[in-house]
Interface confidence: medium
């Protein structure tokens, strides 16, 4: 009796955070003796889709021509190799942006402040939301996520930054969502530049790297984008 079939790997291209209407491909990679690949979507009858492997038979392609709410969710794949099947892959969370209109992000008291001043970022949504995410371009450390108490629907969230220094300078965006469907996000707000002036310094430089966030009910953090094909907004829901 042979050993267990290796667990396949699943990923999405161009990434796991897709704007409404854009195409996305889910790939499942197993072994060369795979005969069929199956993709399961959480909450849907299994298998959600089945594909024959592409040569050299170690992976399969699941195409979504146009991203909609229907496709947002958590996916796992596995493969069949006669007569058995593999363990499920780790989950892939496919998130759709553009489910709601973009919020407006503003800086209080002003986007141009002096080091030591207290600053608050205000994210305002056009329709009531209960979760607001804040991103900073190039940030490698967590930024806060605000969820309203008891799921109350709000039109805004305040992100108090306290007394700022030059490290707080940079480009920020926010996104809003509703907790009952974490896979659906608003369009990102237009960027807002926070410039922090020191007593003897010029305005702080603005990072140019793109953003990527890990977003989950308990874990909301920002990470720099790398070359990982799944870079983008990731959800860690263990």
């Amino acid at each position: 009796q042979a050993g267990p079939l290796p667990k396949p790997t699943v990923w999405a291209e161009p990434g796991s955070v897709i704007s409404w209407g854009s195409p996305v491909t889910i790939w499942c990679q197993g072994t060369l003796d795979a005969q069929e690949y199956h993709l399961d979507k959480e909450g849907s009858p299994a298998p959600w889709d089945t594909q024959n492997p592409l040569e050299p038979r170690n992976k399969a392609k699941f195409s979504i021509p146009s991203m909609t709410q229907h496709y947002a969710g958590r996916y796992r794949c596995y493969y069949h190799s006669h007569p058995d099947w593999s363990e499920d892959s780790d989950p892939l969370d496919l998130v759709m942006t553009g489910a709601y209109s973009k919020p407006i992000l503003s800086v209080l008291p002003s986007p141009l402040v002096t080091s030591g001043e207290s600053v608050t970022l205000l994210c305002q949504s056009q329709s009531p939301m209960d979760t607001f995410l804040l991103f900073k371009e190039g940030a490698a450390h967590p930024l806060p996520r605000l969820r309203s108490q008891h799921g109350a629907q709000l039109h805004w969230a305040e992100f108090p930054m306290g007394p700022v220094t030059s490290v707080h300078g940079g480009t920020y965006r926010c996104i809003s969502s509703r907790s009952f469907s974490h896979y659906l996000l608003s369009r990102p707000s237009d960027p807002v530049e926070l410039t922090v002036l020191g007593s003897l310094e010029s305005p702080s430089p603005s990072p140019t790297r793109s953003i990527s966030a890990a977003a989950g009910p308990e874990d909301q953090s920002l990470m720099p984008t790398g070359s990982d094909p799944q870079s983008g907004l990731r959800r860690h829901w263990e």
Epitope: L5, H80, P83, W85
Partner: nanobody, 121 residues
Framework: EVQLVESGGGLVQPGGSLRLSCAAS????????MGWYRQAPGKQRELVAA???????KIGDSVKGRFTISRDNAKNSVYLQMNSLRAEDTAVYYC???????????????WGQGTQVTVSS
């Protein structure tokens, strides 16, 4: 020659438990995924659970958290432990064997005769 033989069905009250057994010939058991289907009167046959050669399991959504499947390689047998039974679990339960892809296609290669499970007060 009967190659899959089920046992353990019967009448049970709602909330009760039953354990179904299926004995298979060694040649079938050692080289196939084993599983259970059920068919209620007037309804389509549905996959309840399957267990692979390596012991991986798939459990149908309607019974998740209540039913478990296991296989005993020494006895060439597969078992379906059914807990928290409901009236809607009433059906004829069939043991089946085949490649997993055939289970997904609702057409395993081997079938038992079936055993009746009735959940009623």
């Amino acid at each position: 020659e009967v190659q899959l033989v089920e046992s353990g069905g019967g009448l049970v009250q709602p909330g009760g438990s039953l354990r179904l057994s299926c004995a298979a010939s060694e040649s079938i058991f050692s080289s196939n995924v084993m599983g259970w289907y059920r068919q209620a009167p007037g309804k389509q046959r549905e996959l309840v659970a399957a267990v692979g050669i390596q012991g991986l399991t798939k459990i149908g959504d309607s019974v998740k958290g209540r039913f478990t499947i296991s296989r005993d390689n020494a006895k060439n047998s597969v078992y379906l432990q059914m807990n928290s039974l409901r009236a809607e679990d009433t059906a004829v339960y069939y043991c089946a064997a085949g490649a997993y892809v055939r289970f997904l296609q609702q057409s395993p290669d081997y079938w038992g005769q079936g055993t009746q499970v009735t959940v009623s007060s």
